[in-house]
Interface confidence: low
């Protein structure tokens, strides 16, 4: 069946050195346990975390992100999905692509990071 | 239903420049990958380059760096191919190719009709 | 970037006959091959991706084999509108790359 990928609509801000999380549905939410469900930085696709198969596939991962992430799939039987981003760093800083993939049927969602420094924000005093 | 309409055939001299456009109908223009690939004549396909419209930002394979622009316009749904420097070895044929989301991990399932460039003094 | 040899570059065969071209890659890829088929003044035509799933609407007689560096396309009974060019392409790595191609004849 058709879906659509809903992301964020806003950016999602984060403290260097803090962890961070994307969230990613589908709509109409529907079981996803059997997709394919990723998030990749464009252009061209480093790949940030990639659940296929029923399982995580890490060898796929870009080396920058191998160790951080995880993926939160306590709903994912409803179509929803989070991509936990640990140790966040400047360089993780832009765009990031979700996608699901249900047999050839693929559908993706936009959306950006912001990451700033903790310590701009420390008031004086 | 997803079509790429490339723009007419062109010839060229040494030296100049020439510009491509693949305008896409059907889909959602912004999610797509656009890449170039050329064919000279009798010879096998060469990927150029790409992008990802909703993003901008093109990746060029690294024997055109620097003599080839991929950009797009999400507004008309087009997608540009600049070469310049033109030799005579550029005289190929110029598609334009989509993936769904990105060309890492998905392949191209759609094509132009191809853009004939002709290189001669 | 990655390297991909198809072999061989040119195949005669008849109608019915069993064809099989090879394509090789210079480095794992995983599963991330397509094949495509371009006849003479048109645009290639998408297969086969993910190394062996078929492209909706392709007949079944085509299937792609293979992971890691070698991988096969198999036309089952070639029929008269199979004989084409035949490319492999790697989408593995952000620098896309073809195989040279293979030529099928009439023999």
């Known amino acids: 069946g058709q879906f659509r990928v809903i992301g964020p609509r806003h950016p999602i801000r984060a403290l260097v050195g803090d962890e961070v999380e994307l969230p990613c549905r589908i709509s109409p939410g529907k079981n996803a346990t059997g997709m394919e469900v990723g998030w990749y930085r464009p252009p061209f696709s480093r790949v940030v975390h990639l659940y296929r198969n029923g399982k995580d596939q890490d060898g796929d991962q870009a080396p920058e992100y191998r160790g951080r992430t995880e993926l939160l799939k306590d709903a994912i039987g409803e179509g929803k999905v989070t991509l936990r981003i640990r140790n966040v760093r400047f360089s993780d800083e832009g765009g990031f692509t979700c996608f699901f993939r249900d047999h050839s049927y693929q559908e993706e969602a936009a959306m950006e990071l912001k990451v700033e420094d903790p310590f701009y924000w420390v008031s004086p005093g | 239903q997803v079509q790429l309409v490339q723009s007419g055939a062109e010839v060229k001299k040494p030296g100049s420049s020439v510009k491509v456009s693949c305008k896409a109908s059907?889909?959602?223009?912004?999610?797509?990958?656009i890449s170039w690939v050329r064919q000279a004549p009798g010879q096998g396909l060469e990927w150029m380059g790409g992008i990802i419209p909703i993003f901008g930002t093109a990746n060029y394979a690294q024997k055109f760096q620097g003599r080839v622009t991929i950009t797009a316009d999400k507004s008309t749904s087009t997608a540009y191919m600049e070469l310049s420097s033109l030799r005579s070895e550029d005289t190929a044929v110029y598609y334009c190719?989509?993936?769904?989301?990105?060309?890492?991990?998905?392949?191209?399932?759609?094509w132009g009709q191809g853009t004939t460039v002709t290189v001669s003094s | 970037d990655i390297q991909m040899t198809q072999s061989p570059s040119t195949l005669s065969a008849s109608v019915g006959d069993r064809v099989t071209i090879t394509c090789r890659a210079s480095?794992?890829?995983?599963?991330?091959l397509a094949w495509y088929q371009q006849k003479p003044g048109k645009a290639p035509k998408l297969l086969i991706y993910d190394a062996s799933s078929l492209e909706s609407g392709v007949p079944s007689r085509f299937s792609g084999s293979g992971s890691g560096t070698e991988f096969t396309l198999t036309i089952s009974s070639l029929q008269p509108d199979d004989f084409a060019t035949y490319y492999c392409q790697q989408y593995s790595m952000d620098h896309l790359t073809f195989g040279q191609g293979t030529k099928v004849e009439i023999k």
């Open positions: 480095q794992s890829i995983s599963s991330w």
């Open positions: 059907g889909g959602t223009f912004s999610s797509y990958a």
């Open positions: 190719a989509r993936a769904p989301y990105s060309p890492t991990y998905y392949p191209f399932d759609y």
